[in-house]
Amino acid sequence: LNTTVLQGMAGQSLRVSCTYDALKHWGRRKAWCRQLGEEGPCQRVVSTHGVWLLAFLKKRNGSTVIADDTLAGTVTITLKNLQAGDAGLYQCQSLRGREAEVLQKVLVEVLEDPLDDQDAGDLWVPEESSSFEGAQVEHSTSRNQETSFPPTS
């Protein structure tokens, strides 16, 4: 499965759209998880509404929001107020019972805001309304990875 690379600016929002076959995934909830390394387990961040018919409603966990357009076959995840620690490897998943099918692997890179320097001071209100999807460069990642990954915050 190819990995989509998305870039977002620190302090701003990043919108991730994962498309899927609406018929094949009919009735299934979707989830967004963070991999603890390229081959490590995927730690659930947020999932869509427990009632599939209400999947269009936004579900939030901290600064991450998910909503699913089940007719169009698009699940949208918004990472608000990006921080350096948000960089990493994520997955869009389709849930079927205890099983999770990977819809898309997403590598999120967080770029430093060139305007957010010392002169701006510490009190800086992020532009949460904006979204930056960057260049969606597709590439395959097939690197060897260490087998054990420490927990993430």
Epitope: L36, A87, L107, E112, F149
Partner: antibody, heavy 122, light 107 residues
Framework: QVQLVQSGAEVKKPGSSVKVSCKAS????????ISWVRQAPGQGLEWMGG????????NYAQKFQGRVTITADESTSTAYMELSSLRSEDTAVYYC???????????????WGQGTLVTVSS | EIVLTQSPATLSLSPGERATLSCRAS??????LAWYQQKPGQAPRLLIY???NRATGIPARFSGSGSGTDFTLTISSLEPEDFAVYYC?????????FGGGTKVEIK
């Protein structure tokens, strides 16, 4: 076991540049943050900047912006730190350090190089 | 940038005593905080990451606590080899600043 081996000590003239290398072995390289930290004689630790090789984009402390360049070569698992326009106050031990977890959220420095002493003197 | 203030600058204690080191951030760093120990002529050594997780091989007498802006490193009973300089570091956002350090010296 991950090991970071740095290049040897350097003596430089004011105004010149220095490039320090840091070769990683015994573990993967691409998604782990490599940070550069310096320590002037008798002083504390100072974070200069860092890079995640898979991204290739470095981040720098404002103090060093424009004078420091951090790069990484995935093919040789080597990171580099180049500091230009050297002055006497840049005399310090320069360390490279690799995160214990992946990406920036895991950039707590679990593995450290042995340090490279850079002396700037006319 | 986020400023980390460590206190006290110097802590004079005897072996067997309890050491409590403080690190205060100028703004929240969540739990993205690490503690390091450094001895003269050596590279720093990671003790604690993510505010409270002990690194592999670090004795149980070392513990970290706190979140947000206030953090503490506790050494429950000082051993002779624990006398060193201790630094905290945040890695929530760039630049990943260090505190000024706390020197734990023998009384």
């Amino acid at each position: 076991q991950v090991q970071l081996v740095q290049s040897g000590a350097e003596v430089k003239k004011p105004g010149s540049s220095v490039k320090v290398s840091c070769k990683a072995s015994g573990g993967t390289f691409s998604s782990y943050a490599i940070s550069w930290v310096r320590q002037a004689p008798g002083q504390g630790l100072e974070w200069m900047g860092g890079i995640i090789p898979i991204f290739g984009t470095a981040n720098y402390a404002q103090k060093f912006q424009g004078r420091v360049t951090i790069t990484a070569d995935e093919s040789t698992s080597t990171a580099y730190m180049e500091l230009s326009s050297l002055r006497s106050e840049d005399t310090a031990v320069y360390y490279c350090a690799r995160g214990g977890g992946t990406f920036w959220s895991g950039s707590w420095a679990l593995y450290w190089g042995q340090g490279t002493l850079v002396t700037v003197s006319s | 940038e986020i400023v980390l203030t460590q206190s006290p600058a110097t802590l004079s204690l005897s072996p067997g005593e309890r050491a409590t080191l403080s690190c205060r951030a100028s703004q929240s760093v969540s739990s993205y905080l690490a503690w390091y120990q450094q001895k003269p002529g050596q590279a720093p050594r990671l003790l604690i990451y993510d505010a409270s997780n002990r690194a592999t091989g670090i004795p149980a007498r070392f513990s970290g606590s706190g979140s947000g802006t206030d953090f503490t490193l506790t050494i429950s009973s000082l051993e002779p080899e624990d006398f060193a300089v201790y630094y905290c570091q945040q890695y929530v956002n760039w630049p990943f600043t260090f505190g000024g350090g706390t020197k734990v010296e023998i009384k």
